[in-house]
Interface confidence: low
């Protein structure tokens, strides 16, 4: 047999842990251009702001609404023209700058300002860009909610308000002193019209070590926290197990009078299916991929290089993951691909559920990035990279292992052909992709953000939803709003969508948009005219104006839509890159909704506009708390300008409808819940570039496929005869905000 003699296995050497030195990739020296700010840079900016803004500045971690504080500091991306002048023409690099968001609460007219600070690492200037970017000062009510504000709301709820309904809460919900067996969860937006700051909070059992999100106790409180003095905050409305009350005191009075039908909700602790701790003992180790001759890519700072691809990666504090200066075989394809916004719109028969529209950029896809767990979130042997940030603090912090980069054998041929016709041969190529990944946990949901680089020159952007569903207390006729998923829990229907900015530069900056599709055209059969044939033809149309290239969700979109240059490939076709969407988005919020303009991008599955420096983002961190008067309204970008021969940006929406079901307990699975898009070469090359891959396999029927010199796979028993050098498991830890 092939199993050896049953004795001790021979000691295999460890596989190399670093790349072989003689690799064709290089790291251009511009990695700093798009790199997120370092700890040192963040510290320098904070020191400078503290000097310039004076002694009235309070640490945002302790700031009250009536204080001045620095909310955030992050990289101010350089202007594209200056960046390209540096990257392509050797001009000096543009000044490295930071963007700070500052809350000015301690002044007669509180507002929010955006300040650009530079040059880094030694700042000497501060420029207030609020008016030029937003047309006026940013109203104070639009500011995101600080951790301290949530703490103050909890203080108010648990110390001042809940004791007013202690009888009912003791009866229904095992009420302990000041309710600390309960936790609150915010919803958003916060009110019904511009200027409001009134948030529905749901109350849940505080289940340690498991998802409280599934344990709603049926109580929801509308907290008006617009006043600058927390002592003046009020409960505007109370909702309990299907009915509305004006106050907790009124609810308690009605309970005492026997007028409240109370459902006793068990506090089942962590033992149920909502726990993520498996009841099954560990089994055999699952499959593991390794690099037999060391990784075939390298990561230096924010820049990644492989034999095919180079790019920079980063994370916007609010907008989330982004990549820049993507080059395939040395040629730039993409200046920027960046997540812009994520949105979840809920339905239900409780006020929290029916009003929830989470505009996640208002919380922050970067801010709520989590450490990646080796071997679960990414392959065990991936390369892990930290992220430094300065958010709601006076000092920088670090999320360990915030990104992972890995090469992965997909277990699928990229292309293959087995020939038995006329001649005998096999040719193919195992698809190996390069992946950069990060993940954000926004309250209950976890999002996986993937950028996948394929050897064919294609780039795939995909996001997956997992984590806990958001739930509501089960009462009344719930069939319209989801499915029952446990004894007292309704899994509430919702949509997920994400918006991406895709700044393709296809063989240069000047691009055109082409739409191609198919049509059946009837014709008489030439050799038998009495018969008719439906002949399949290609339709081609040049889209010249922004309005023509703005496709609403649910509308017919050309099956082939690509950006092309005026340069041709060898066969005379414009060199192009196709945008192929993979999305099954739900219905967008109707346009007559007063808040739809706050995420108007949701209406468009794809829109192509002229790239403008003053239209850097399709959303804003401020849109969540004032979607009725949005700081950025994406639909303003589509103003029927020409898109012929211009620097273009494609804006792509991907999403899906989720009707939660029993199998979403304990967590939603990523399977079937991943959407996104591909950027695929379309006549960009003269043939498939993977034709030149060193991983290609080819042998003829008259060759010995088991010979190492004929077939590289035959060399594996020697070339891959090493044991992977597995680092000890470590975890990036947990934040304690």
């Amino acid at each position: 047999g092939r199993g050896g003699d049953g004795g001790e296995p021979s000691q295999l050497p460890h596989c190399p842990s670093v790349s072989p030195s003689a690799q064709p990739w290089t790291h251009p020296g511009q990695s700093q251009l798009f790199a997120d700010l370092s700890r040192e840079e963040l510290t320098a900016v904070m020191r400078f702001l503290t000097q310039r803004l004076g002694p009235g500045l309070v640490d945002a971690a302790q700031a009250r609404p009536s204080d001045n504080c620095v909310f955030s500091v992050e990289l101010q991306l350089p202007p594209k023209a200056a960046a390209l002048a540096h990257l392509d023409r050797g001009s000096p690099p543009p000044a490295r700058e930071a963007l700070a968001i500052v809350f000015f609460g301690r002044q007669p007219q509180p507002n929010v300002s955006e300040l650009v600070v530079g040059p880094l690492p030694h700042p000497s200037y501060m420029r207030d860009v609020t008016v030029e970017r937003h047309g006026g000062p940013l109203p104070y009510h639009r500011r995101p909610v600080l951790f301290q504000e949530y703490l103050d709301i909890d203080q108010m709820i648990f110390n001042r308000e809940l004791p007013q309904a202690s009888g009912l809460l003791h009866h229904c919900c095992f009420y302990k002193h000041r309710g600390r067996n309960l936790v609150t969860m915010t919803t958003a937006p916060r009110g019904l019209q511009s200027g409001d700051r009134a948030t529905w909070f749901g109350l849940y059992y505080n289940i340690s070590g498991a998802g409280f999100f599934l344990h709603h106790v049926g109580l929801e409180l509308l907290v008006n926290h617009k006043a600058l003095d927390p002592a003046r905050w009020t409960i505007q409305k109370v909702f309990y197990q299907g009915r509305y009350y004006d106050s907790l005191a009124q609810l308690e009075a009605q309970f005492e009078a026997g007028l409240v039908n109370v459902v006793l909700i068990p506090d089942n602790g962590t033992g149920g299916s909502w726990s993520l701790k498996s009841p099954v003992p560990p089994g055999p180790a699952p499959p593991l991929q390794f690099y037999p001759q060391g990784p075939r890519f390298s990561v230096q700072g924010s820049r990644v290089a492989s034999s095919l691809w180079t790019f920079s990666f980063g994370l916007g504090a609010f907008s989330g993951p982004r990549i820049f200066d993507v080059r395939f075989q040395g040629e730039r394809l993409v200046y920027e691909i960046s997540l812009q916004e994520a949105l979840a719109i809920y339905g239900g028969n409780s006020p929290a559920a029916m009003t929830t529209r989470y505009v996640d950029g208002g919380f922050g896809m970067g801010k709520y990035t989590t450490p990646l767990t080796r071997g679960v979130d990414c392959p065990y042997l991936a390369t892990y990279v930290d992220w430094h940030f300065l958010l709601e603090s006076q000092a920088p912090k670090t999320i360990r292992d915030a990104f992972c980069v890995f090469e992965q054998n997909q277990g699928l041929p990229l292309r293959r052909h087995h020939s038995d016709l006329y001649s005998h041969y096999f040719g193919g190529l195992a698809e190996t992709v390069l992946v950069v990944r990060s993940m954000s946990t926004l309250l209950n949901y976890d999002y996986v953000w993937d950028t996948v680089f394929h050897p064919s020159g294609a780039i795939e952007i995909r996001f997956y939803a997992t984590g806990y569903i958001s739930s509501a207390f089960l009462f009344g006729a719930t069939g319209k709003y989801g499915n029952q998923v446990s004894e007292h829990t309704l899994g509430t229907v919702h949509t997920h969508s994400a918006h991406f900015k895709v700044d393709l530069d296809v063989a240069g900056l000047e691009n055109w948009v082409w739409a191609e599709d198919m049509v059946f055209v009837p014709m008489a059969v030439p050799w038998s005219p009495e018969h008719q044939l439906q002949r399949l033809q290609v339709t081609r149309k040049l889209l010249e104006m922004e309005e023509q290239a703005a496709f609403l969700v649910g509308s017919a979109t050309p099956r082939y839509l690509y950006l092309a240059s005026n340069h041709s490939n060898k066969w005379g076709h414009p060199r192009g890159y196709r945008i192929q969407m993979l999305s099954f988005a739900g219905e967008p919020l109707p346009q007559n909704s007063s808040m739809a303009r706050g995420f108007s991008w949701e209406r468009y599955q794809l829109a192509v506009t002229q790239r403008k420096e003053e239209e850097p983002s399709s959303s804003s961190v401020f849109n969540q708390n004032d979607p009725w008067a949005p700081t950025v309204d994406f639909s303003d970008f589509i103003n029927n300008e020409t898109i012929a021969g211009k620097d273009l940006v494609a804006w792509v929406t991907a999403g899906f409808l989720h009707i939660p079901h029993a199998e979403d307990i304990p967590n939603t699975v990523t399977v079937g819940n991943g959407v996104g898009f591909f950027l695929r070469p379309y006549n960009f090359f003269d043939e498939d570039p993977s034709f030149y891959s060193a991983d290609s396999i080819y042998f003829r029927g008259d060759q010995d496929a088991g010979a190492c010199e004929v077939n590289p796979l035959a060399c594996l028993p020697q070339a891959a005869a090493c044991a992977p050098d597995l680092p000890a498991f470590s975890h990036g830890g947990f934040s304690h905000n």
């Epitope: 008016v131 047309g135 006026g136 019209q193 511009s194 008067a629």
Partner: antibody
Framework: EVQILETGGGLVKPGGSLRLSCATS????????MNWVRQAPGKGLEWVAQ??????????YYGESLEGRVTISRDDSKSNVYLQVNSLRPEDTAIYYC???????????WGPGTMVTVSS | DIQMTQSPASLSASLEEIVTITCQAS??????LAWYQQKPGKSPQLLIY???TLADGVPSRFSGSRSGTQFSLKISRLQVEDIGIYYC?????????FGGGTNLELK
């Protein structure tokens, strides 16, 4: 102190043309959108035209009643805005106000206006 | 285009009286609404924007409210200097349109 002053009004024959000017001071002109709004004698207000700032590529927008006969322009170096009106008709008789837009959409400061009379 | 219907067209009121003027939008405009005051022989002045926010320097006796597509301007205690014509304006989408105006006179 924000100041806006319109000039260039007067009596014009039907079919004639007119160029109105608006001089501003007391604020950072480059940051704002500028508008023309008119008011016929004894009547209400009617928005005529808007020009956005450099950050918005000096995009221009026009109301329907004058569209095709009117051009708005600006000179950031002089903090001036202009309105060229062609093929004037008697119904174009009105006070023409120059105004500034804050928050992109509201007219927060207005000039005193300049009277345009179209009559033979 | 969005039509703005203002009522009443004219109104006589006494000093210290409460005065309410309404404006109806032909479609949903969110909070994108402003109120202007025009005194005889003068140019208009911004009073309220975003439906409810007082412009700088406007007395607190002026207030704005919204109910769906209907908007109201309220003067809590009428003063002599409040006499003039009041206009609403929608700022939801171009072309920006004004109501026909309400002429407020002293009784």
């Amino acid at each position: 102190e924000v100041q806006i002053l319109e000039t260039g009004g007067g009596l014009v024959k039907p079919g004639g043309s007119l160029r109105l000017s608006c001089a501003t001071s007391g604020f950072n002109f480059n940051d704002y959108f500028m508008n023309w709004v008119r008011q016929a004698p004894g009547k209400g207000l009617e928005w005529v035209a808007q020009i956005r700032n450099k950050h918005y590529n000096y995009a221009t927008y026009y109301g329907e009643s004058l569209e095709g006969r009117v051009t708005i322009s600006r000179d950031d170096s002089k903090s001036n805005v202009y309105l060229q009106v062609n093929s004037l008709r008697p119904e174009d008789t009105a006070i023409y106000y120059c105004s500034r837009s804050s928050y992109l959409r509201y007219f927060d400061f207005w000039g005193p206006g300049t009277m345009v009379t179209v009559s033979s | 285009d969005i039509q703005m219907t203002q009522s009443p067209a004219s109104l006589s009121a006494s000093l210290e009286e409460i005065v309410t003027i309404t404006c109806q939008a032909s479609q949903d405009i969110g909070n994108w609404l402003a109120w202007y005051q025009q005194k005889p022989g003068k140019s208009p002045q911004l009073l309220i924007y975003d439906a409810t926010t007082l412009a700088d320097g406007v007395p607190s006796r002026f207030s704005g409210s919204r109910s769906g597509t209907q908007f109201s301007l309220k003067i809590s205690r009428l003063q002599v200097e409040d006499i003039g014509i009041y206009y609403c304006q929608q700022a939801s989408s171009a072309p920006w349109t004004f109501g026909g105006g309400t002429n407020l006179e002293l009784k």
